[in-house]
């Protein structure tokens, strides 16, 4: 039975040209995290495998940095980075947990962080 929950940074906004940390946290389960996939819509951004380490997709290598922790740092943000981001936690023996983050990249300097929220 899957008892865990994923807490994410929720709906967030950031300035064009700036950087942002995408963060998810899996709680309420003793399942072992084997791999975390970070995806933007249906495009793979990065993978962190418990045994093999990090892989950043070649098309994002210049703008994506691993961490902190299992999170992901997006740099040199453009308006095109606006959209949904998913953290996918592959766990044993529970299975897969998915968290969603919506990022809005703003032209102005009025970029505020949204509230944290939970996805069961």
């Amino acid at each position: 039975m899957m008892t865990g929950t994923i807490e994410t940074t929720g709906n967030i906004s950031a300035e064009k040209g700036g950087s942002i940390i995408l963060q998810c946290h899996l709680s309420s389960t003793t399942a072992q995290v084997t791999q975390v996939n970070w995806e933007q819509q249906d495009q793979l951004l990065a993978i962190c495998n418990a045994d093999l380490g990090w892989h950043i997709s070649p098309s994002f290598k210049d703008r994506v940095a691993p961490g902190p922790g299992l999170g992901l740092t997006l740099q040199s943000l453009t308006v095109n980075d606006t959209g949904e981001y998913f953290c996918i936690y592959h766990t044993y023996p529970d299975g897969t947990y998915t968290g969603r983050i919506f990022l809005e990249v703003l032209e102005s300097s009025v970029a505020e962080h949204g509230a944290r929220f939970q996805i069961p």
């Epitope: 084997t34 995806e39 495998n49 045994d51 093999l52 592959h90």
Partner: antibody, heavy 121, light 108 residues
Framework: QVQLVQSGAEVKKPGASVKVSCKAS????????MHWVRQAPGQGLEWMGV????????SYAQKFQGRVTMTRDTSTSTVYMELSSLRSEDTAVYYC??????????????WGQGTMVTVSS | EIVLTQSPGTLSLSPGERATLSCRAS???????LAWYQQKPGQAPRLLIY???SRATGIPDRFSGSGSGTDFTLTISRLEPEDFAVYYC?????????FGGGTKVEIK
């Protein structure tokens, strides 16, 4: 073109170990991950694990954890898979398979010809 | 782990006919992390399709893949004599990577 040549068939007693080799050519050996997959007689395919390009990182399927060791020798472009504490259920054809991407994508691009391992008392 | 169920177990068809093979996953395989392999007797498997629908290098266009989520299909538009073999689907979304039980395409 990519070529993966595996060692010959083995017959082992229960409790023994077996070490299968896979010699690669036709591509930059240091760039790709190598997987091992096995197939019991008349059965389907079973992923065992993967080893990184430098040999420093490995990831094994839970089922084989503690019994399997994957290594690689860059000087000879060879990957090895050792399975210990053999039992009759380990009788299978063992394949090495190179990954399609420059990471552990899991897409098995090129395969060795297979090595038959028979475990029998 | 993700369990893949292939159907039918055996498909009996004649050369020139269309073959439709199904693969169903026990949970959603995001972003179509699904591959298809062909295996002939006494040979190693060969990669046909990855990403659910992208043909591997050198694979003829009579082979096509489709589907997303939990339901995937491999279609061989017009069977050639060399296409009679066992076909396996594989998910590479969630470790451990797993394979379906296979579909045997045999000559009717």
């Amino acid at each position: 073109q990519v070529q993966l040549v595996q060692s010959g068939a083995e017959v082992k007693k229960p409790g023994a170990s077996v070490k299968v080799s896979c010699k690669a050519s036709g591509y930059t050996f240091e760039k790709y991950y190598m997987h091992w997959v096995r197939q019991a007689p008349g059965q389907g395919l079973e992923w065992m694990g993967v080893i990184g390009p430098s040999g420093a990182s490995t990831s094994y399927a839970q089922k084989f954890q503690g019994r399997v060791t994957m290594t690689r020798d860059t000087s000879t472009s060879t990957v090895y898979m050792e399975l210990s504490s053999l039992r009759s259920e380990d009788t299978a054809v063992y394949y090495c398979a190179r990954d399609h991407s420059d990471y552990w994508s899991g897409i098995l691009h090129s395969w060795g010809q297979g090595t038959m391992v028979t475990v029998s008392s | 782990e993700i369990v893949l169920t292939q159907s039918p177990g055996t498909l009996s068809l004649s050369p020139g006919e269309r073959a439709t093979l199904s693969c169903r996953a026990s949970q959603s395989v995001r972003s179509s992390y699904l591959a298809w392999y062909q295996q002939k007797p006494g040979q190693a498997p060969r990669l046909l399709i990855y990403g659910a629908s992208s043909r591997a290098t050198g694979i003829p266009d009579r082979f096509s893949g489709s589907g997303s989520g939990t339901d995937f299909t491999l279609t061989i538009s017009r069977l050639e004599p060399e296409d009679f073999a066992v076909y396996y689907c594989q998910q590479y979304f969630s470790p451990p990577w797993t394979f379906g039980g296979g579909t045997k395409v045999e000559i009717k």
